[in-house]
């Protein structure tokens, strides 16, 4: 059979190869397509409801006036010539639309080096077959799941045109000390061949580094963190961001109602007072970030305090020195 | 929403002429064939005629060829049928009917409009 | 031309019956037939297109099937509303043939 494509919504003619060129004629069209269960026979005589997909025209071709999804299939023409020859024509018909150019949509202006951000989603409308979506960093492909690019696809079906939507949402991890303007495109890949890409435009969002934070110091004094009953603990909180973060405190686990303040002072210590402290430095551009724990206890006479404090990661339910 | 309005219908006399409109809204008139369907008083249905969306193809059954023409004004959103040499027969309501072809045949109906044919 | 042969031509029913109504195509016409309802006095309405695909706004009560070039309109439990003259229509080929219609009337 000889293959045919041909877009959606235009005309076609297909040749009924060996028929006299005007009537009478002695020719059958038969067609096997999404119209059809098995086979449909259209004469030059005919006319009729099939007109508006499939007619024959006077030279014998068959002329479809506006092809559609439906009209995919198997072609065939068996014609006699005046001599009493038989030719037979066979043609396989595949349809295709291409989409509006795609677009990049909900884009991001600025992306974080070191972690996962979503670049953007690429929407195609309108294609048939559905073809495919690719992203390209600085012109070169993007290879899903390598190098910290990850891509989330989606492809729906008009429930009247059964023409495709294909989404593509990027995610990427942008290399620390990398390009800080990256350009990134997004292209649809037509499903039949011998049609080039459509691109979209490209965006630039910007890289921020983020500084790496310096630990939140917790200093205990008395040093280690064990007085004696009706004592003073000092905690200080020291953090060498700039500006000066707020400075909130726990204790077990749980927030002190109190004002922000990098001192913490617990005058005449009693036994309510023992637990393990940390403080919390809220950052307006990185968020919390939490203190090692220290655990405060008293010291009855006669029993030797410990020489240290607690020591624990960032957050509580650590060791305590008792 | 979609609509379909015949008018036109009436008393006529045997052998004498009448022209039925149908003025369409609420969709995209010349995507679609039409189709005039009749019904006479009591019986079944009948196909009476259908035109392609441009007009340039009409269909009749042979009860009517040669003597009734349906026609359309895609400008004016409207659909015509012109019946000569009427007979007694020919006595039915009439509808205009959206579609006709295999991709949408008579989704839609009018109201129907009654011609009369009698002396 | 192609014959549409309807049957039964009138039934009685009750409210909450299965009903069943038969079109029987002269030669083969592929999916194109649909079903019509129709009351006195007023236009026919479309129930069933391409043999057996609801259309809008159609209760699912209704429905179609076919096999070779028998078509098939089944009501599973007949409403009030229901009462009417039922028709099928024939539209792969011209001329576009109607069955005979199918009065269902209450017991």
């Known amino acids: 059979a000889q293959n045919i494509t041909a877009r959606i919504g235009e005309p076609l003619v297909l040749k009924c190869k060996g028929a006299p060129k005007k009537p009478p004629q002695r020719l059958e069209w038969k067609l096997n397509t999404g119209r059809t269960e098995a086979w449909k026979v259209l004469s030059p005589q005919g006319g009729g409801p099939w007109d508006s997909v499939a007619r024959v025209l006077p030279n014998g071709s068959l002329f479809l006036p506006a092809v559609g999804i439906q009209d995919e299939g198997i072609f065939r023409c068996q014609a006699m010539n005046r001599n009493g020859k038989e030719t037979k024509s066979n043609y396989r018909v595949r349809v295709y639309q291409i989409p509006g150019k795609p677009e990049i949509v909900d884009s991001a202006s600025e992306l974080t080096a070191g972690v996962p951000n979503k670049v953007g989603t690429c929407v195609s409308e309108g294609s048939y077959p559905a073809g495919t979506l690719s992203w390209h960093l600085d012109g070169k492909p993007l290879v899903p799941n390598e190098k910290g690019v990850s891509v989330k696809e989606q492809t729906r079906r008009h429930p009247e045109t059964g023409l495709f939507t294909l989404q593509s949402e990027l995610m990427v991890t942008p290399a620390r000390g990398g390009d800080p303007r990256p350009t990134f495109s997004c292209s649809f890949s037509p499903g039949l061949p011998r049609h080039r890409a459509l691109r979209t435009a490209p965006i630039q969002p910007r890289v921020w580094e983020p500084v790496p934070l310096e630990e939140v110091q917790l200093v205990v004094e008395p040093e280690g963190g064990a007085v004696a009953p009706g004592g003073t603990v000092t905690l200080t909180c020291e953090v060498p961001a700039q500006p000066s973060p707020q400075i909130h405190w726990m204790k077990d686990g749980v927030p002190l109602p109190l004002p922000p303040s990098p001192v913490l002072i617990l005058p005449e210590i009693g036994p309510q007072d023992q637990g393990t402290y940390s403080c919390v430095a809220t950052h307006s551009s990185h968020g919390p970030q939490e203190s090692r724990a220290v655990s405060i206890s008293i010291i009855e006479p006669g029993e030797e305090g410990p020489t240290a404090g607690s020591v624990g990661g960032s957050g509580l339910g650590t060791l305590a020195l008792a | 929403e979609v609509q379909l309005v015949e008018s036109g219908g009436g008393l006529v006399q045997p052998g004498g002429s009448l022209r039925l409109s149908c003025a369409a809204s609420g969709f995209t008139f010349n995507n679609y064939w039409m189709t005039w369907v009749r019904q006479a008083p009591g019986k079944g249905l009948e196909w009476v005629a259908s035109?392609?969306?441009?007009?340039?193809?009409?269909y009749y059954p042979d009860s009517v060829k040669d003597r009734f023409t349906i026609s359309r004004d895609n400008a004016k959103n409207s659909l015509y049928l012109q019946m000569n040499s009427l007979r007694a027969e020919d006595t039915a309501v009439y509808y205009c009917a959206r579609g006709g072809d295999i991709k949408v045949s008579l989704d839609r109906w009018g109201q129907g409009t009654l011609v009369t044919v009698s002396s | 031309d192609i014959q549409m042969t309807q049957s039964p031509s009138s039934l009685s029913a009750s409210v909450g019956d299965r009903v069943t109504i038969t079109c029987r195509a002269s030669?083969?016409?592929?999916?194109?037939v649909n079903w019509f309802q129709q009351k006195p006095g007023k236009a026919p309405r479309r129930l069933i297109y391409?043999?057996?695909n609801l259309a809008d706004g159609v209760p699912s009560r209704f429905s179609g099937s076919r096999s070779g070039t028998d078509f098939t309109l089944t009501i599973s439990s007949l409403q009030p509303e229901d009462f009417a003259t039922y028709y099928c229509?024939?539209?792969?080929?011209?001329?576009?043939?109607f069955g005979g219609g199918t009065k269902v009337e209450i017991k």
């Open positions: 229509l024939e539209f792969d080929e011209h001329p576009l043939t």
């Open positions: 030669q083969d016409v592929g999916i194109y």
């Open positions: 391409r043999a057996t």
């Open positions: 035109i392609d969306n441009s007009g340039d193809n009409t």
